[in-house]
Interface confidence: low
């Protein structure tokens, strides 16, 4: 997804509209594109992204990409269509309610990516494997 092409400021956040002015309702995601991050060696991190967007297309989900190289750490938060690759990777976990980071092979850097489909789910990025099975919050969302 390209960053929102038309935006309205609402409570310091942004809401995305299409060319007809219709606001796409389905998914609310953090959408700060690429920002420098201090998230490192933690089980989970908050995105520290103050922009919540309603995704441009109804089918889009939330995505977070964490990258570390010799110089810096960045965190990318966007909306993206799970039918399309992102950074050359398929969004395998797009149906998950939580953004559980999985490492991907990228030369010259450490690269983690997650996708999820609950409101603002890319605000809290999870590196700990224990969240896959033992987190009661996650179980509640899935099974309630």
């Amino acid at each position: 997804t390209i960053p929102p092409h038309v935006q309205k400021s609402v409570n310091n956040d942004m809401i995305v509209t299409d060319n007809n002015g219709a606001v796409k309702f389905p998914q609310l995601c953090k959408f700060c594109d690429v920002r420098f991050s201090t998230c490192d060696n933690q089980k989970s991190c908050m995105s520290n992204c103050s922009i919540t967007s309603i995704c441009e297309k109804p089918q889009e989900v939330c995505v977070a990409v964490w990258r570390k190289n010799d110089e810096n750490i960045t965190l990318e938060t966007v909306c993206h269509d799970p039918k399309l690759p992102y950074h050359d990777f398929i969004l395998e976990d797009a149906a998950s309610p939580k953004c559980i980071m999985k490492e991907k092979k990228k030369p010259g850097e450490t690269f983690f990516m997650c996708s999820c489909s609950s409101d603002e789910c890319n605000d809290n990025i999870i590196f700990s494997e224990e969240y896959n099975t033992s987190n009661p919050d996650l179980l509640l969302v899935i099974f309630q």
């Epitope: 409570n11 389905p26 103050s50 409101d119």
Partner: antibody, heavy 122, light 107 residues
């Protein structure tokens, strides 16, 4: 069990203000977007407003924009609707409802409160 | 705003009847269509989401179909507890507008 309980309705004069509350329990409140929907006596359902889980994003129906403010206190598991400059046409039962988180159900409101009646009359 | 038009606005039927309610959107909404049931003095209840998926706990006699602009709610065999008002709602764009409702009454 998911429960939503509205309060704060009542009789108010035109031009007056009212604040509705919706106490939520039985689910993780702060990860769900919440909505207000109203129903005038003998009429159909009208969507009023939505607020994201963090409270960062809000949206309003044109009929209430600039007069109503939706907000939430996640520490209290409570949703609010501040209604100012009330008009006779705002008379309705106001429902708070939870917006589903499931991907294919997103946008649907899967749980509703019992509603609270707001009457605007002189 | 997307306009949602339901038909009929009311209908009379008997227990055991097959009942069909239609909902038309003013523009394509893909499958972002939900159906609610409301009984007098009560809050609406979600029956069908995403045009054809049955909400948990809803009897299988309720079914939904359609995509794009035309949608249908069917009650295969009307039961006494089904007499109520039914609303469609699009959740494709904000505001998520409702149809005007269809009241199902006892014949």
């Amino acid at each position: 069990e998911v429960q939503l309980v509205e309060s704060g309705g009542g009789l108010v004069q035109p031009g007056g203000s009212l604040r509705l509350s919706c106490a939520a329990s039985g689910f993780y409140f702060d990860i769900y977007a919440m909505t207000w929907v109203r129903q005038a006596p003998g009429k159909g359902l009208e969507w009023v407003s939505v607020i994201s889980g963090s409270g960062g994003t809000t949206y309003y129906a044109d009929s209430v924009k600039g007069r109503f403010t939706i907000s939430r206190d996640n520490s209290k598991n409570t949703l609010y609707l501040q209604m100012n400059s009330l008009r006779a046409e705002d008379t309705a039962v106001y429902y708070c409802a939870r917006r589903s988180q499931y991907r294919d159900k997103v946008g649907a409101t899967d749980y509703w409160g019992q509603g609270t009646l707001v009457t605007v009359s002189s | 705003d997307i306009q949602m038009t339901q038909s009929p606005s009311s209908l009379s039927a008997s227990v055991g009847d097959r009942v069909t309610i239609t909902c038309r959107a003013s523009q394509s909404i893909s499958s972002y269509l939900n159906w609610y049931q409301q009984k007098p003095g009560k809050a609406p209840k979600l029956l069908i989401y995403a045009a054809s998926s049955l909400q948990s706990g809803v009897p299988s006699r309720f079914s939904g179909s359609g995509s794009g602009t035309d949608f249908t709610l069917t009650i295969s065999s009307l039961q006494p507890e089904d007499f109520a008002t039914y609303y469609c709602q699009q959740s494709y764009s904000t505001p998520p507008t409702f149809g005007q409702g269809t009241k199902v009454e006892i014949k």
